[in-house]
Amino acid sequence: RKIPKVGHTFFQKPESCPPVPGGSMKLDIGIINENQRVSMSRNIESRSTSPWNYTVTWDPNRYPSEVVQAQCRNLGCINAQGKEDISMNSVPIQQETLVVRRKHQGCSVSFQLEKVLVTVGCTCVTPVIHHVQ
Amino acid sequence: GITIPRNPGCPNSEDKNFPRTVMVNLNIHNRNTNTNPKRSSDYYNRSTSPWNLHRNEDPERYPSVIWEAKCRHLGCINADGNVDYHMNSVPIQQEILVLRREPPHCPNSFRLEKILVSVGCTCVTPIVHHVA
């Protein structure tokens, strides 16, 4: 999948654009908003009726090298009595993010953008029930 | 930057860290081509903490379209289909990396940007405190 070129008429390519070899693009990996601290709701993963755990995946040839993945703790959901209710389902919620992959071909190195699907948490859903003949 | 394992036979001058600026192939390696969450599942409607999806579009960003979740209710849907306000619908937020055109409007020059998106909602049992 290619990154679309800027096609809007009011987006005239400025003179200041850096020269880029064909088939590639220039990417600055100094992240905008890198140090912005987000106030996330504390402990929602353990207070949710569809609780989840986190696992950190590490890959030194990826930027960022750390990606956190969530896994639902239960198949069902936790009811008001704190028991698992199998008539409901805990399901993962996923979101795509971009990473930069570094590839070694002999002694030369190339960089590739990659979309990664991250499981960010879980939600409790009513299952769709089908009765099979 | 992050340390990269080097092929032992390569010259020592190779930088172990990711350089600040890299040239990247225009093709994105990706098997997950469906970026519209409405098409990928109907969890947003079937959840006990349902949410609406709002389209956020920015031509200076890749991907230019990002879907933002907004919880439909303050509480959660109970077994009778009513909203139970003793429970909370809470957004699940995630920091993701996107590409920002830099300088602006340039077709093939980008910078990574970290943004916070609400991906969906989950139902939470709050701990209750009675304020004296």
């Epitope: 106030s39 709701s41 504390r42 | 909370n88 809470v90 701990i127 209750v128």
Partner: nanobody
Framework: EVQLVESGGGSVQAGDSLRLSCAAS????????FGWFRQTPGKEREFVAG????????EYANSVKGRFTISRDNAKNTVDLQMDSLKPEDTAVYYC?????????WGQGTQVTVSS
Amino acid sequence: EVQLVESGGGSVQAGDSLRLSCAASGRASSINWFGWFRQTPGKEREFVAGIRWSDAYTEYANSVKGRFTISRDNAKNTVDLQMDSLKPEDTAVYYCVLDLSTVRYWGQGTQVTVSS
């Protein structure tokens, strides 16, 4: 620690109006929503109205829709409940609720009495 100060309760005639206020102080950061429940003797506390902090989305119990209006002041961490066209069945103790997603704080309550 979080403090909630409720005010504005009292006794009125049916058809009159009252305005309840609730101010939060202390470590009231990351507010999810702010609102009001009410309780009459022998009954469970019921939700009246709530306002989400991030986008001012409001929700009301069917019994008060069109008569009650909830509003907030972000800068002051306050929420107001404007109660119009009051009915005798609105008589209850009204509790302010501050919700921080995983933790919820209840105020001490303020009495509202509506006589016919």
